[in-house]
């Protein structure tokens, strides 16, 4: 009986010779559980597993803890891959995180973290980041040290408020912090002075809601 080939991430898929960007099936580490992800095989050498994407506001990102844990949306459009999969993937191997951003004026920028991982659910999928480079700000817009993940039904931030309810979307809120890529999507000309938009402060400043965002990961030794 021929054993089915499984891939844990898009880098493995790329190295297997499948080098076209698109949706692929990934398998949880040490498991048969599967998840569908978008693989970017063109950006910067390819092999990127997309874990978040925003582009048009077609998907509601004000979701529950369970939904952020398991993932939602469509890998062909707006989606969240799932905290549990990303946690398991990044805890067993060293990954880099690239965050690609677009504004409404036609500019693009990125932040690259040389080491990224999420703690497990018992630690509220706390984010860990080191080694920031890139064009989207010299200071990390994800608060350092990393915060726990919060959603509308699971408040783990450091604010007297409930950041996820106030700003909308699940995120690694501080109190509430300089970023929220899962905030409310606002169209062009309605995207400034927003208290709950898609925010990356150290690139576009306060209240500016971005046009498009992509978070993607790849093994550091790719």
């Amino acid at each position: 009986k021929e054993e089915k080939t499984t891939f844990r991430d898009c880098a493995e898929i790329f190295k297997s010779g499948l080098t076209t960007s698109g949706i692929y099936t990934l398998t949880f580490p040490n498991s048969t559980e599967e998840v569908k992800a978008y693989c970017d095989m063109d950006m910067g050498g390819g092999g990127w597993t997309v874990i978040q994407h925003r582009e048009d506001g077609s998907v509601d990102f004000q979701r529950t803890w369970k939904e952020y844990k398991e993932g939602f949306g469509s890998p062909l459009g707006e989606y969240w891959l799932g905290n549990e999969f990303v946690s398991q993937l990044t805890s067993g191997h060293r990954y880099v995180l690239k965050i690609q951003l677009k504004d409404w004026e036609g500019s693009e920028a990125h932040s690259l973290y040389e080491h990224f991982y999420l703690s497990g659910e018992e630690s509220n999928y706390r984010i860990h980041l080191t080694g920031l480079t890139g064009t989207a700000g010299k200071i990390s817009s994800i608060s350092q040290p990393g915060s726990d993940f919060s959603t509308k039904d699971s408040d783990n931030d450091k604010c007297i408020c409930k950041c996820s309810q106030m700003l909308t979307g699940g995120w690694w809120f501080d109190a509430c912090g300089p970023s929220n890529l899962n905030g409310q999507y606002y169209p062009q000309k309605q995207n400034t002075n927003k208290f709950n938009g898609i925010k990356w402060y150290y690139w576009k400043g306060s209240g500016y809601s971005l046009k498009a965002t992509t978070m993607m990961i790849r093994p550091a030794d790719f």
């Epitope: 450091k158 604010c159 007297i160 106030m166 109190a175 927003k194 208290f195 306060s206």
Partner: nanobody, 129 residues
Framework: EVQLVESGGGLVQPGGSLRLSCAAS????????IGWFRQAPGKEREGVSA????????YYADSVKGRFTISSDNSKNTVYLQMNSLRPEDTAVYYC??????????????????????WGQGTLVTVSS
């Protein structure tokens, strides 16, 4: 639509006074803190003063304590900055900005710059003889 409009800037002699106004629309002051910031040419934007809880809590930078007074008129949805004993080093563009009042870190009294998501266009204050 959230809007903040500053007014009251101008040219004043050292030792003189000015009163800046910040008119807010699209939200009510009851649930928000309003900060005044300033930016001199070639310098970083810095916090000057802030107010929340209908004036129950106020903040002043050390450089303006005793000279500047912040106040609010919630019926007009406007915040004021009374600036007395002005000095040449007070010359800057003055901005007002808003943040939901609840967006406070446990144990803290005021807000970092990046929490202020709504900003006005600014008003220029020049202190010169």
């Amino acid at each position: 639509e959230v809007q903040l409009v500053e007014s009251g800037g101008g040219l004043v002699q050292p030792g003189g006074s000015l009163r800046l106004s910040c008119a807010a629309s699209g939200f009510t002051l009851d649930d928000y803190a309003i900060g005044w910031f300033r930016q001199a040419p070639g310098k970083e934007r810095e916090g000057v003063s802030a107010i929340r809880d209908n004036g129950g809590s106020t903040y002043y930078a050390d450089s303006v304590k005793g000279r500047f007074t912040i106040s609010s008129d919630n019926s007009k949805n406007t915040v004021y900055l009374q600036m007395n004993s002005l000095r040449p080093e007070d010359t800057a563009v003055y901005y007002c900005a808003a943040v939901p009042a609840g967006r406070l870190r446990f144990g803290e009294q005021w807000y970092p710059l990046y929490e202020y998501d709504a900003w006005g266009q600014g008003t220029l204050v020049t202190v010169s003889s």
